[in-house]
């Protein structure tokens, strides 16, 4: 997150981190039920760990943290790397969470976001596009949903109904490492961090997010059948 601020501890209890090896964060994730996460399909890896209930970027133990393995990764069938359409994936964890003040699921919005809606995006991704500036703790940023027209003008030929754009003034954006993390609007999960221009946080190049309202049925059906 570029030019965000430290999230209040436990204010984003649905925020998850996908880790390679012992503690290499590469993507965010969102807890949507006691045993299921959502993330971006481009975050798919054969082996990874899941960390919930953690505030710090560092591997230091926190009393609220819970660690999991992914036992099933189910990318949306319409996703094709390295394209950006249908960029979502369900992850089934090896066990259910212990519900606590630090770890709680978030409800997915059934209605699509409208222009001007204020939302919160969060993550432990880079705080600049120099690739090695990471925050000490989870970052939060208020962003505004942009019109479809403005979104398409920003990225001609690259936007479809499975995406929406959101941003703020130049200098505020999600960035590398935030993928798969939550965009929460009015208390409900509206999107996932997906893509945007490089470097992050450029004028007229907003962040692009997976438009989850288009996938509510697929998410429910997939969870029910697995």
């Amino acid at each position: 997150i570029v030019n965000g601020s430290d999230c209040q501890k436990d204010a984003q209890p649905w925020q998850g981190a996908l880790l390679l090896g012992p503690n290499k964060l590469y993507c965010g994730a969102v807890l949507i039920s006691p045993q299921w996460l959502l993330t971006a399909a481009h975050c798919r890896k054969p082996v990874f760990r899941i960390r919930l209930g953690h505030h710090s970027m560092s591997p230091v133990y926190e009393s609220g943290q819970q660690m999991f393995q992914g036992i099933k990764s189910i990318p949306h069938p319409g996703y094709s790397h390295p394209g950006h359409s249908n960029d979502l994936m369900l992850i089934k964890m090896n066990r259910k969470i212990r519900d606590s003040h630090s770890v709680k699921p978030v409800e997915i919005a059934c209605d699509c976001a409208t222009e001007g809606t204020r939302c919160m995006v969060s993550g432990w991704g880079t705080t600049s596009s120099s690739h090695n500036n990471f925050p000490k703790v989870l970052q939060c940023l208020n962003i505004t949903v942009l019109s479809e027209e403005r979104c398409k003008n920003s990225y001609p030929g690259q936007i479809d109904k499975t995406m929406f754009c959101a941003g703020d003034e130049e200098g505020r954006d999600s960035c590398q490492g935030d993928s798969g993390g939550p965009v929460v609007c009015n208390g409900k999960l509206q999107g996932l961090v997906s893509w945007g221009d490089f470097p992050c946080a450029q004028r007229n190049r907003p962040g692009v997010y997976t438009n989850l309202c288009e996938f509510v049925k697929w998410i429910k059906d997939t969870m029910n059948s697995n």
Epitope: G21, P82, H84, Q176, S179, F198
Partner: antibody
Framework: EVQLVESGGGLVQPGGSLRLSCAAS????????MNWVRQAPGKGLEWVSY????????DYADSVKGRFTISRDNAKNSLYLQMNSLRAEDTAVYYC???????????????????WGQGTTVTVSS | DIQMTQSPSSVSASVGDRVTITCRAS??????LAWYQQKPGKAPKLLIY???SLQSGVPSRFSGSGSGTDFTLTISSLQPEDFATYYC?????????FGGGTKVEIK
């Protein structure tokens, strides 16, 4: 078949110019970042330039900054390297290479260059 | 710029030998290192990405390890087709930089 084919190399005098081209086929070119990498005779690999999928981010090695210009035409599935003010030390085989990392995607994961052309030879000599 | 230092610059080995090549970065690059193989007159070929992930189609006798500044490429049992030059490359930070190369020769 995924393929990159370079062209445009040749013999040029110091101070002269050349334009290299790289024709891509077998994959969705507009989704990938691209690089130019060169190799002087008997030497190792040297990264020259990078261009993101939408051309919004471009970078160069210090040794070519201000003299070389990378560009792409996604409609033509083509990558280019305009080389001006050429010097003897620019003599090398020039490769275009596909970057597996999508700088647009916001994961923190980096791959490398998975598809390379056969190379085109540039000789700068009087 | 990040400097990449490979060692040794050359190694003589026989078919069946275990060969280890090291690469050191002048600053930490996490796991974001790639290894390439290049045969004379040919383009480089990606062997390993993210320090330890094997590129599709690459034989399992090749493996990579390391994190931070120190990395290793290992060929567990050298085959005749493995005699080539090997390069490491750091990929997270521009300018991308390669190691100087390690030539694996027949003893």
């Amino acid at each position: 078949e995924v393929q990159l084919v370079e062209s445009g190399g040749g013999l040029v005098q110091p101070g002269g110019s050349l334009r290299l081209s790289c024709a891509a086929s077998g994959f969705t070119f507009e989704h990938y970042s691209m690089n130019w990498v060169r190799q002087a005779p008997g030497k190792g690999l040297e990264w020259v330039s990078y261009i993101s999928s939408s051309s919004s981010y471009i970078d160069y090695a210090d040794s070519v900054k201000g003299r070389f210009t990378i560009s792409r035409d996604n409609a033509k599935n083509s990558l280019y390297l305009q080389m001006n003010s050429l010097r003897a030390e620019d003599t090398a085989v020039y490769y275009c290479a596909r970057d597996l990392t999508s700088m647009q995607s916001r994961d923190y994961y980096y791959y490398g260059m998975d598809v390379w052309g056969q190379g085109t030879t540039v000789t700068v000599s009087s | 710029d990040i400097q990449m230092t490979q060692s040794p610059s050359s190694v003589s080995a026989s078919v069946g030998d275990r060969v280890t090549i090291t690469c050191r970065a002048s600053q930490g690059i996490s796991s974001w290192l790639a290894w390439y193989q290049q045969k004379p007159g040919k383009a480089p070929k990606l062997l390993i990405y993210a320090a330890s992930s094997l590129q599709s189609g690459v034989p399992s006798r090749f493996s990579g390890s390391g994190s931070g500044t120190d990395f290793t490429l290992t060929i567990s049992s050298l085959q005749p087709e493995d005699f080539a030059t090997y390069y490491c490359q750091q990929v997270p930070i521009f300018p991308y930089t390669f190691g100087g190369g390690t030539k694996v020769e027949i003893k």
